[in-house]
């Protein structure tokens, strides 16, 4: 059993010798050897080595103020074991009462301002030491402040202003923002961006889809966890090696930028929710034959952004070679049977309902215990709702009575 020592001595016991040396240099030593009760989130030696060299030099050149302040921002003036560190707590540090965000995740990981406790609960005579995997940088700024100051987020900033979201990111909270860089916006087809930015509802949905109402540090992410966004739909956050994935794609290029109301992860792709997509954009890989035909036969232009439609999209293998080699006029008539004049969600369909297509045909709905069918064809899973319509997936081509 290791002997119990005061907090200063305990830093040496746990191997946080750089933090111990800095505590000595900054005159913090006598405080943490003396009376009182402290919790010290002590960066490991490796954490100090990984700190930006300019920041580190700045601290070392001003030990009595900058370094002391930085070390105080890693401390609480009472003993708190990991069991006392409850998820969602904001604990005032010993530097200007700046908040320390505590996250205690279901997987057992405990983070302080997104720094992970890698060696916890080393009891001292006058407190406790928890070794953390990175140096906490001071966070006097909000997510809004960070966005306003970061040149590489100017596109996101402008989009957030346009959709009245920016101010919300300056308020108190525990947000997680997946912030697309300018490069991310450049990857979007210009037409998609021009349409969304001209539509208040779609642009607000787009912005809110990048925000979670909970604080998710990268250290907490294990498997593919699903989180609800402010937009209302969910995103899946996972990992692939050291990289964070969003909806299965590696896109986070800078993680865990901690602010006083949450955390920011910079991403190199814009996340587009279904609610901001045009109905034709909702189709997946299994409906490409249908969407290609809709485009080729001039029906895509009929799906105006300001109208509302429902696509009854047959899967690719519903289209036989015979169907695909039909006369184009006949094929166009068949496709028109798969586009409704109005937006009809899955939960709005009922047995005996009559639906009118853009070609003027009437289709009957049949609701069974285990299936929803329109005429001869039954639906598969995967219905979606977009900005100007809905899409339902069908096993076969629909043949009106």
């Amino acid at each position: 059993v290791l002997p119990i020592d005061h907090v200063y001595g305990t830093l040496g016991i746990v191997g946080a010798t750089t933090t111990q040396r800095y505590s000595d240099a900054s005159k913090l030593r006598e405080e943490i050897e003396g009376k009182g009760s402290f919790t010290y989130f002590a960066p490991s030696n490796e954490a100090w080595d990984n700190l930006d060299s300019d920041i580190r030099r700045g601290l070392e050149s001003n030990v009595n103020v900058e370094l002391l302040n930085a070390l105080h921002s890693h401390m609480i003036n009472k003993r708190m074991l990991t069991k006392d560190l409850k998820n969602g707590m904001i604990i005032p540090s010993m530097y200007n009462n700046l908040g320390l965000f505590i996250n205690h995740y279901p997987n057992g990981v405990v983070t302080v301002n997104c720094a992970r406790i890698i060696h916890g609960n080393q009891i001292a005579t006058n407190g406790v030491v928890h070794v953390i995997d990175r140096v906490l940088t001071q966070i006097g700024t909000s997510i809004q402040d960070f966005i306003e100051a970061e040149d590489d987020l100017s596109s996101f900033r402008a989009a957030a202003i346009t959709s009245d979201i920016l101010e919300a990111l300056g308020r108190d909270g525990h947000f997680t923002l997946f912030a697309p860089t300018n490069e991310a916006f450049e990857k979007l087809p210009r037409g998609v961006l021009e349409r969304i930015m001209g539509d208040k509802v779609a642009s607000e949905a787009l912005m809110k889809y990048h925000i979670l109402n909970t604080l998710q540090c990268s250290e907490s992410i294990m498997g593919g966890a699903v989180f609800e966004t402010l937009e209302g739909n969910t995103i899946e956050i996972g990992c692939d090696g050291d990289s964070i994935t969003v909806n299965g794609i590696k896109m986070v290029n800078k993680k865990d930028i901690v602010t006083n109301n949450g955390v920011i992860h910079l991403i190199d792709q814009v996340l587009i929710p279904d609610s901001a997509k045009q109905v034709i954009e909702l189709a997946g890989k299994q409906q490409t034959t249908f969407t290609d035909l809709v485009a080729q036969l001039g029906l895509a232009s009929a799906l105006r952004p300001d109208g509302e439609y429902t696509l009854l999209a047959p899967v690719n293998n519903a289209f036989s070679d015979d169907t695909l080699s039909m006369d184009q006029r006949l094929l166009k008539l068949i496709l028109q049977n798969h586009i409704l004049k109005v937006k009809v969600g899955l939960n709005e369909l009922y047995n005996g309902q009559i639906l009118e297509t853009i070609g003027g045909k009437q289709l009957r709905v049949f609701v069974y215990r285990t299936a929803v069918c329109i005429e001869n064809s039954c639906m598969e899973k995967g219905s979606k709702q977009g900005r100007n319509g809905a899409i339902h997936i069908f096993r076969e081509i629909i043949k009106p009575a």
Epitope: S154, T162, N182, E183, G191, M197
Partner: antibody, heavy 118, light 110 residues
Framework: QVQLVQSGAEVKKPGASVKVSCKAS????????ISWVRQAPGQGLEWMGW????????NYAQKLQGRVTMTTDTSTSTAYMELRSLRSDDTAVYYC???????????WGQGTLVTVSS | QSVLTQSSSASGTPGQTVTVSCSGS????????VNWYQQLPGTAPKLLIY???QRPSGVPDRFSGSKSGTSASLAISGLQSADEADYYC???????????FGSGTKVTVL
């Protein structure tokens, strides 16, 4: 403050090429794209295309595809637009404009007059 | 030949409100946002309104934009002599995959 300074006026013969430069200052060049817009004498504005200063990706107007090339030099924060096989109807003032897509063409260069005449 | 149609001129006396209109189709204004540019005589254009109704910082609130269907309009209230300029509307055209401008409207302060 943000500034886009373009190269001086040019007089070219039909069939020749012209290369106009646009030097940016006052902002992080690679964080924004550049669009090129031209204006024939007494006429309206015509968008020619866009280039990403971050990775050099381009998007040209269909009408000019094959005749126009846009490039950037990040070391000098300069964008270039080259137009080949010049015709008399290419006589215009050529403008570069900072283009972050979300806010299109928020700062403009002073313009470069290109005259195509035999 | 511009894809977006603007009236060639508009005028008003100081203090009045002048409205500049811009008409397009379902593939440009009908599908996408509208931006407005002001070009003072002998100078480069300047962004006035983006995303239908957003003013960049530095643009007075006397300038306002709106869009409805396949048309858009720019209103200039409290008209000043400094507002004498050409005004261009612009939008992305999905069918041409290009950014299109209106023919321009010359605003004169009487």
């Amino acid at each position: 403050q943000v500034q886009l300074v373009q190269s001086g006026a040019e007089v070219k013969k039909p069939g020749a090429s012209v290369k106009v430069s646009c030097k940016a200052s006052g902002y992080t060049f690679t964080s924004y794209g550049i669009s090129w817009v031209r204006q024939a004498p007494g006429q309206g504005l015509e968008w020619m295309g866009w280039i990403s200063a971050y990775n050099g990706n381009t998007n040209y107007a269909q009408k000019l595809q094959g005749r126009v090339t846009m490039t950037t030099d990040t070391s000098t924060s300069t964008a270039y637009m080259e137009l080949r096989s010049l015709r008399s109807d290419d006589t215009a003032v050529y403008y570069c404009a900072r283009d972050m897509l979300v806010v299109p063409f928020d700062y403009w260069g002073q313009g470069t007059l290109v005259t195509v005449s035999s | 030949q511009s894809v977006l149609t603007q009236s060639s001129s508009a005028s008003g006396t100081p203090g009045q409100t002048v409205t500049v209109s811009c008409s397009g189709s379902s593939s440009d204004i009908g599908s996408n946002r509208v931006n407005w540019y002001q070009q003072l005589p002998g100078t480069a254009p300047k962004l006035l309104i983006y995303s239908n109704d957003q003013r960049p910082s530095g643009v007075p609130d006397r300038f306002s934009g709106s869009k409805s269907g396949t048309s858009a309009s720019l209103a200039i209230s409290g008209l000043q002599s400094a507002d004498e300029a050409d005004y261009y509307c612009a939008a992305w055209d999905d069918s041409l995959s290009t950014y299109v401008f209106g023919s321009g409207t010359k605003v004169t302060v009487l």
